[in-house]
Amino acid sequence: VKMAETCPIFYDVFFAVANGNELLLDLSLTKVNATEPERTAMKKIQDCYVENGLISRVLDGLVMTTISSSKDCMGEAVQNTVEDLKLNTLGR
Amino acid sequence: VKMAETCPIFYDVFFAVANGNELLLDLSLTKVNATEPERTAMKKIQDCYVENGLISRVLDGLVMTTISSSKDCMGEAVQNTVEDLKLNTLGR
Amino acid sequence: EICPAVKRDVDLFLTGTPDEYVEQVAQYKALPVVLENARILKNCVDAKMTEEDKENALSVLDKIYTSPLC
Amino acid sequence: EICPAVKRDVDLFLTGTPDEYVEQVAQYKALPVVLENARILKNCVDAKMTEEDKENALSVLDKIYTSPLC
């Protein structure tokens, strides 16, 4: 149920976009054989993050991690084990 | 009430550590005149994030942003504006 | 495989209206500062990207979702 | 100024026991995968860092909290 294990290359590209470094984005997009027009499109998205600064990257990263670790993604089963985990792992 | 505005340099350093990018960490630590032994210590923490992979960074980032945007940090006032914002910003 | 909720978020970011996208973000994180940021990013992307750009971005996403690395 | 809840989280990460740290994380995000990750990170830091390393990390935090950038 680990979030990034569901599709690691997606998070690789997402965080490269949000990072703002064009060549780091190129590194990630190389892995999926992205064409030049596809890269240009992704760099336009990256420009928006760069223009809006660090706070923008942090907040959108928060949205992505919140969705990724939500019940919708993690499944009901994970939610149901919370109390068990609190009792067992936390030694209460 | 913006989370990173409460202490932007803290989030700068935290996300540099969790990101796994040594350069970003060095840049952040330069801002607070960290010594070499201090940088070495922070890089040991960063190594733990790197060793545990992307999932680890994302999940711990989620914890930090959740705490930072919790009632304990943001105060009651912010929480109370959520419904207003949903009504106004979302044009419902 | 990618989580459907994440896929929906990204699809709306590219092809939805600003209201649709922000409304979807609000289901997960309804903090004013987060929603304001989501709207700013969405407006920026809509202003910067042509229809062809958006098709190319969707094509990248398709490559990501079908990649052995996903 | 840094939020006290954030400061407490970081202090426990460096100076608390694994149980204390995970218990504190659970107050904010009690998902099993999150708590498991918190424990893994805490154990890693405890194994990797000497007492001197931890003092140096706390010194960095002190510099952060007293910085004009905070």
Partner: antibody
């Protein structure tokens, strides 16, 4: 750290093609980025392209698009660069280099270089 | 393309001296900068990355610094093995480019 062993010197005629190899060992090839770089005698370096060994995906310097073609053979952990329509301006030493870092941005481990001479 | 301008193009120094080489980028490269040493007839060797992080096995007499568009490499107490050519290189936008090089010779 690993090793990068490049093929021997080449003397070729203008208009011909050449295929250079870079055999690697001592690291996980499938998760590596390998770049190729050009250096004329007494001059600086020029990045040509990189390849991600895991998928064969490539990124090129626009100046070398259509000129250089990068491939890998995972079974032998070898990277190749096919250089076509050679001119005297292509005479140079060509290096392969493995990327390093988090993220893998830096050209850290280099082959010994292959001298290519283009002459009629 | 981001242009990297290195100076000086060449310099002479004696063993034990301290020298500084500078590199100017035509745009902000946000510290994504590396320095390489290349001895005669050899492959380049990575010395510094992230503008100031020493690569494995590089002696501490080498140090990198800078930010934005201005960067420098300082070599303290020059040793005989330090003579050769030095190059800076950015990793910000495509293509990653190198400076023209600085040839460091024995006085």
């Amino acid at each position: 750290q690993g090793q990068m062993q490049q093929s021997g010197a080449e003397l070729v005629k203008p208009g011909a093609s050449v295929k250079l190899s870079c055999k690697t060992s001592g690291f996980t090839f499938s998760s590596s980025y390998i770049s190729w770089l050009k250096q004329k005698p007494g001059q600086s370096l020029e990045w040509i392209a990189w390849i991600y060994a895991g998928t064969g995906g490539t990124t090129y310097n626009q100046r070398f698009t259509g000129k250089a073609q990068l491939t890998v053979d995972s079974s032998s952990s070898t990277a190749y660069m096919h250089f076509s329509s050679l001119t005297t301006d292509d005479s140079a030493i060509y290096y392969c280099a493995r990327h390093y870092g988090n993220p893998p941005a830096w050209f850290a481990y280099w082959g010994q270089g292959t001298l290519v001479t283009v002459s009629a | 393309d981001i242009q990297m301008t290195q100076s000086p193009a060449s310099l002479s120094a004696s063993v034990g001296e301290t020298v500084t080489i500078t590199c100017r980028a035509s745009g902000n490269i946000h510290n994504y900068l590396a320095w390489f040493q290349q001895r005669q007839g050899k492959s380049p060797q990575l010395l510094v990355y992230n503008a100031e992080t020493l690569a494995d096995g590089v002696p501490s007499r080498f140090s990198g610094s800078g930010s934005g568009t201005q960067y420098s490499l300082k070599i303290s107490s020059l040793q005989p093995e330090d003579f050769g050519s030095y190059f800076c290189q950015h990793f910000w936008s495509r293509p990653p480019t190198f400076g023209g090089g600085t040839k460091l010779e024995i006085k």
